[in-house]
Interface confidence: low
């Protein structure tokens, strides 16, 4: 059955209640210089309106503080109101390493990110940090890498490993959850000149992730004890016509081309899904496409296989699909899939259909295909036009979390966290945020607060209290003692 009745119950005490933000652009200078300037000024308010320095007078200054960054203050205020336990945000690779290699490290950017993490920890909010979050036409790559063919160039994967190592080194004592790359399976939108471009770029992204994971595993895990994965875009697919076999096959094929494409090499075999490889090859044989998945060497298969500590999925909606044979040598046509918009479904302004049961089906599919592993939903949300009473978002959150709870309680899926997308909306972009672009709170915040404080949807008499374990206390308190050491 698609929908089942709501359940009452709670998520475990160690469940991560998160909120996701995309790339945080580092502030280059703390925006409160008045505390670090030792000079006294007189303001000529009636004349030239300029500040004139008073010579011979020096004031006491205080050391620079993380909260001198105006941006960080705003984020902390928003996070405090969200009452989340985790904050997922992305670093800007191009800001940290403008040259793409370690010859020019932007220390100020790293200081800014360290401030975001450490100030969050003071509020009891842990960070899940994404190293690479391509969101725009120039892909968020350092410019020299972009102009050297970006992800079509295998050396970009090596450059990524060096960047990841720098971040682990600089932030890893405070960050215990890492995402290397956000939605590499969606870069097909950009590398779409041909299927071979798409599959070539994807191959280099997989290698980049694996190199970073292996570096962490070898060099940083022993002391930092964190976990590393990558986030896959993971919408569910349903046959448009459940009575048509070809639609069922199309739905499974969508999942193979969208999720298994990256999950199979990393979680399971070290190679691309056999179904995907065979489907592309059969189209090639029939002259319908000149695409081919890269052939992996034994060394590459060994490099890729097993390089994840948990499964991270970004899930927003369910797509209705049907089979349609398409000619052409691009990823989109290689799949032979057509999407149908079901106008009877509740949808958002960007036409995201609200289909809560899809997330439960997805979680079961992942466990069935890749085994019983820790799963985090690292982004999930909907755009809602309302600037104050965002009812669609409240409905979406309530219903989707219900289905995640069913997956946990009934299906016994090892779901470890849910990260709502996103903290604040951006000007002239679809409104996914809990806060407006000028930082006004929406009513969905209270709704999410209530779910978090209840740890789900408890029976009326059940307690939402969790006993603070020794381990948890140590995580936050000792961390600060270590931090404060001279």
């Amino acid at each position: 059955k698609e929908s089942t009745p709501d359940v009452q119950g709670q998520f475990p005490c160690d469940f991560s209640w998160g909120v996701t933000e995309s790339v945080l652009k580092p502030e280059s200078v703390a925006s409160s210089p008045q505390f670090s300037d030792p000079h006294l000024y007189v303001w000529n308010a009636t004349g030239n309106r300029l500040l004139h320095r008073v010579e011979g007078v020096r004031l006491k200054t205080r050391p620079a503080q993380c909260t001198d960054f105006v941006n960080i203050k705003k984020q902390l205020e928003m996070l405090a109101r969200m009452k989340v336990t985790h904050y997922r945000f992305a670093l800007d690779w191009a800001s940290v390493l403008p040259t793409g290699n370690l010859s020019a490290v932007n220390r100020q950017a790293l200081r800014y990110y360290r401030c975001v993490v450490s100030e969050g920890l003071k509020l009891g909010i842990s960070a899940m940090v994404t190293l690479y979050y391509p969101t725009h036409a120039h892909l968020g790559l350092p410019e020299p890498l972009l102009h050297a063919d970006g992800w079509l160039n295998p050396s970009t994967a090596e450059a990524f490993q060096a960047y990841a190592g720098l971040c682990f080194q600089e932030l890893g004592d405070l960050v215990k959850l890492w995402i290397t790359i956000n939605e590499p399976n969606r870069l097909s939108d950009i590398y779409n000149r041909s299927g071979n471009d798409t599959y070539g770029a994807a191959h280099n992204l997989l290698v980049a992730h694996a190199l970073a994971w292996r570096l962490y595993d070898r060099q940083f895990r022993p002391s930092q004890r964190g976990a590393v994965s990558l986030s896959l875009h993971a919408d569910w697919a349903e046959p448009a016509n459940p009575y048509a076999d070809s639609h069922w096959r199309a739905a499974e094929r969508f999942l193979q081309f969208e999720i298994a494409w990256f999950a199979e090499p990393l979680f399971k075999t070290g190679d691309y899904p056999a179904a995907m490889r065979e489907y592309i090859a059969s189209k090639h044989r029939r002259g319908l496409s000149s695409s081919a998945l890269p052939r992996l060497t034994e060394a590459e298969r060994r490099l890729l296989k097993g390089t994840v500590d948990f499964c991270a999925l970004n899930h927003f909606t369910t797509r209705f699909v049907m089979h349609e044979q398409l000619a052409g040598s691009r990823y989109d046509s290689d799949r032979d899939i057509q999407f149908l918009q079901d106008i009877t479904r509740l949808s958002s302004p960007t036409r995201l259909a609200v289909i809560p049961w899809g997330v439960r089906k997805l979680l079961r599919w992942v466990r069935r295909n890749y085994g019983d592993m820790d799963i985090y939903i690292t982004a999930s949300g909907i755009d809602d036009q309302a600037l104050e009473d965002d009812r669609l978002r409240k409905y979406y959150l309530g219903k989707y979390l219900q289905e995640v709870l069913k997956a946990y309680l009934i299906d016994k899926v090892r779901i470890k966290g849910y990260y709502a997308f996103k903290l604040a909306e951006e000007k002239s972009k679809p409104r996914f945020g809990f806060f407006t672009s000028d930082f006004k709170a929406k009513s969905s915040i209270q709704f999410y607060n209530k779910v978090i404080s209840s740890r789900g949807f408890p029976f009326e008499n059940s307690s939402s209290r969790c006993s603070q374990t020794q381990e948890n206390t140590e995580c936050t308190v000792c961390l600060f003692l270590v931090q404060k050491k001279p």
Partner: antibody, heavy 120, light 108 residues
Amino acid sequence: QIQLQQSGAELMKPGASVRMSCKASGYTFSSYWIEWVKQRSGHGLEWIGEIFPGGGSTIYNENFRDKATFTADTSSNTAYMQLSSLTSEDSAVYFCARRGYYDAAWFDYWGQGTLVTVSA
Amino acid sequence: QIVLTQSPAIMSASPGERVTLTCSASSSLSSSYLYWYQQKPGSSPKLWIYGASNLASGVPGRFSGSGSGTSYSLTISSMEAEDAASYFCHQWSSYPLTFGSGTKLELK
């Protein structure tokens, strides 16, 4: 301190080619773009293109694609621009400049310029 | 390509006078990628303003820059003799990179 030192003035015949140099010092040469800019007497500035010495990537203004060729030698910290099939229209001062990235993509250091005169 | 149009082409100003130079872009660009350079005869251009409104190191405080979208300006609050020079706006919002035709500022 950071400097870009350009080669001396050139007097060339129409149809010939000229190669000018731009030697960088005081910073990591391979880590910044080198820009080339043309300025004809009494005219404004015209961007010719850029080279990233670290990987040899080049980007040309379409108007100069068949005219200019950029190269860089990281062992001597020197960038070169060759202009081919010279005509009187190519008589100008040519500047090299260093460029930063993304939100610091301005030309922060300039060479003193190389004057090229094309005359029969 | 983005065409930058500067006006006026030439202007004269007396010492102490307030001067405004304008730069108009043929299509909207991010102010982060709009720069101004000063050039004196026989010299190379010098970065003067970056990100539309930030003064480069060593630029006197009487200079200021503003603007967004397609319209930008450079202002001198009180003209001084050393400000006589040519000023070029420049964009890095899209390729090819382009410069304005320049404004020559003379001392009256």
